[in-house]
Interface confidence: low
């Protein structure tokens, strides 16, 4: 007996072939011997079964001796043994219909759990293997659980249900509500305008919620709220903003904040949170600001950075077109009695320059 796996709500073809490649009499029946469909002349006839309005056959294939039964909008209860009678022979096909659904909304916040539940016919013992868009493989039986969703789990999940060495594949679209990046760092010279961007890793037709940016300046003992805002149908409106610094916010997505000037007292790290309407929990993105200042005071040329820098970053002072360089894995470097000329202060990571500031040292006569 042939086994065919189908998907709930889908279409399945149960094949029945005759040796003669021409129209011939055929009937499909269920295990209770109730007629589902058959042929009468060139017409397709339907029997009294519950399937009759969802069962069909493709006439164009009859001339090839193929008398398939196509069952549309499959239900779990369609699982049964079907009998094709053609040319005085009987062919049996066992159809097993499975359904795989997400227990909750398929739009989930990063860190939330996803549970997929398999509906299966009585007496079956299927196994399920799911592959996330990021390539993560998860196996299970009647349920599959992903305890903590990550942003790379967003997209189409491919789940394979196996039974009797046969497989059927489901695709479930999961949207993980998160920012594109967990963290980002902006490097700026003192006095420059700072742009913070918080692109979302998903798109929704209607996006409503509220958010806030908390900031922990390196020099400050506690964090403070820099800005709060509302989001209504992808339109951003500022609710409250501090006087110092006076942030500006874009009215459209992606969420965009402008700090008029990068100053050492603003260097530090922030946490932007976004609470979406009808969703429990919040989206988070960390943002860091690193500020550089190069100064000359009397016989001392100093370069300093403020903000969260990794210990492996190198700060250098270098005289343009000359070999004179001082480098340190520190937050400040200096040169006593610097030569006249254009000096460069460089913050770099393994040779890649992250931030650069130039300062001209004039000759002292």
């Amino acid at each position: 007996k042939k086994v065919v796996l189908g998907k709930k709500g889908d279409t399945v073809e149960l094949t029945c072939n005759a040796s003669q490649k021409k129209n011939t009499q055929f009937h499909w029946k269920n295990s209770n011997q109730i007629k589902i469909l058959g042929i009468q002349g060139l017409f397709l006839t339907k029997g009294p079964s519950k399937l009759s309005d969802r069962a069909d056959s493709r006439k164009s294939l009859w001339d090839q001796g193929c008398f398939s039964m196509i069952i549309k909008n499959l239900k779990i209860e369609d699982s049964d043994t079907y009998i094709c009678e053609v040319e005085n022979k009987k062919e049996e096909v066992e159809l097993l219909v499975f359904g795989l659904t997400a227990n909750s909304d398929t739009h989930l916040l990063e860190g939330q759990s996803l549970t997929l539940t398999l509906e299966s016919p009585p007496g079956s013992s299927p196994s399920v293997k799911c592959r996330s868009p990021g390539g993560k493989n998860i196996q299970g039986g009647r349920t599959i659980s992903v305890p903590q969703l990550e942003r790379q789990d967003s997209g189409t999940w491919t789940c394979t249900v196996s039974q009797d060495q046969k497989t059927v594949e489901f695709k479930i679209d999961i949207v993980v509500l998160a920012f594109q990046k967990a963290s980002s760092t902006v490097y700026k010279k003192e006095g420059e305008q700072v742009e913070f961007s918080f692109p979302l890793a998903f798109t929704l037709e209607k996006l409503t919620g509220s958010g806030e940016l908390w900031w922990q300046a390196e020099r400050a003992s506690s964090s403070k709220s820099w800005i709060t805002f509302d989001l209504k149908n992808k339109e951003v409106s500022v609710k409250r903003v501090t006087q110092d610094p006076k942030l500006q916010m874009g009215k459209k997505l992606p969420l965009h904040l402008t700090l008029p000037q990068a100053l050492p007292q603003y260097a530090g790290s922030g946490n932007l949170t976004l609470a979406l309407e009808a969703k429990t929990g919040k989206l988070h993105q960390e943002v860091n600001l690193v500020v550089m200042r190069a100064t000359q005071f009397q016989e001392n040329l100093t370069c300093e950075v403020w903000g969260p820098t990794s210990p492996k970053l190198t700060l250098s002072l270098k005289l343009e077109n000359k070999g004179a360089t001082v480098s340190k894995q520190a937050k400040a470097v200096w040169v006593l009695n610097p030569e006249a000329g254009m000096w460069q202060c460089l913050l770099s990571d393994s040779g890649q320059v992250l931030l650069e500031s130039n300062i001209k040292v004039v000759p002292t006569w």
Epitope: D10, I70, V168, E169
Partner: antibody
Framework: QVLLEQWGAGLLKPSETLSLTCAVY????????WTWIRQPPGKGLEWIGE???????NYNPSLKSRVTISIDTSKNQFSLKVKSVTAADTAMYYC??????????WGQGTLVTVSS | DIQMTQSPSSVSASVGDRVTITCRAS??????LAWYQQKPGKAPKLLIF???SLQSGVPSRFSGSGSGTDFTLTISSLQPEDFATYYC?????????FGGGTKVEIK
Amino acid sequence: QVLLEQWGAGLLKPSETLSLTCAVYGGSFSGYYWTWIRQPPGKGLEWIGEINHRGSTNYNPSLKSRVTISIDTSKNQFSLKVKSVTAADTAMYYCTRPDSNWFDPWGQGTLVTVSS
Amino acid sequence: DIQMTQSPSSVSASVGDRVTITCRASQDISNWLAWYQQKPGKAPKLLIFAASSLQSGVPSRFSGSGSGTDFTLTISSLQPEDFATYYCQQANSFPLTFGGGTKVEIK
């Protein structure tokens, strides 16, 4: 058994639009990504792109600017259009279905020749 | 894009010979690899999926092995109907890519 039957114009002039259609018979239509693959004469296989029953598409970046894949779920058909064709688009075009991740079954193929 | 490099590009063999074709991915693709057979004028046919699983109806003389970046298709005892071109394909990431092909010819 799933049967893929494809058709479309076989001879085109440069700058014209290639148009092919693939009909899916007998098998599952929803839940899969329906795919187009091409093979220039005497060369290897190149994945063009895919579409699912919801109309979600993925394209090969090398062709994305010229390619459109669309779907008609009411007819269990999906189509390929390639605009501004050149001789480099001369190939055998196949429609296929990734069953899980692997292409099976395939259409019979349609040879498209671009010549002035 | 993940590049798939097949070697050799062609191989001459006799009926009964053991033939080995290799495929190398430009990055780790775990076991997301398939092998296809294509005969002139025909569509490719799936032989092996998930690097080593034999597709239903494919003779057991075909086998696949490998993981990560290096993969092998072996035909244990070449039959007349096996003279064809063989392609590997990665399903790890978009765009899906194929190897350049290996033509198995009669010696």
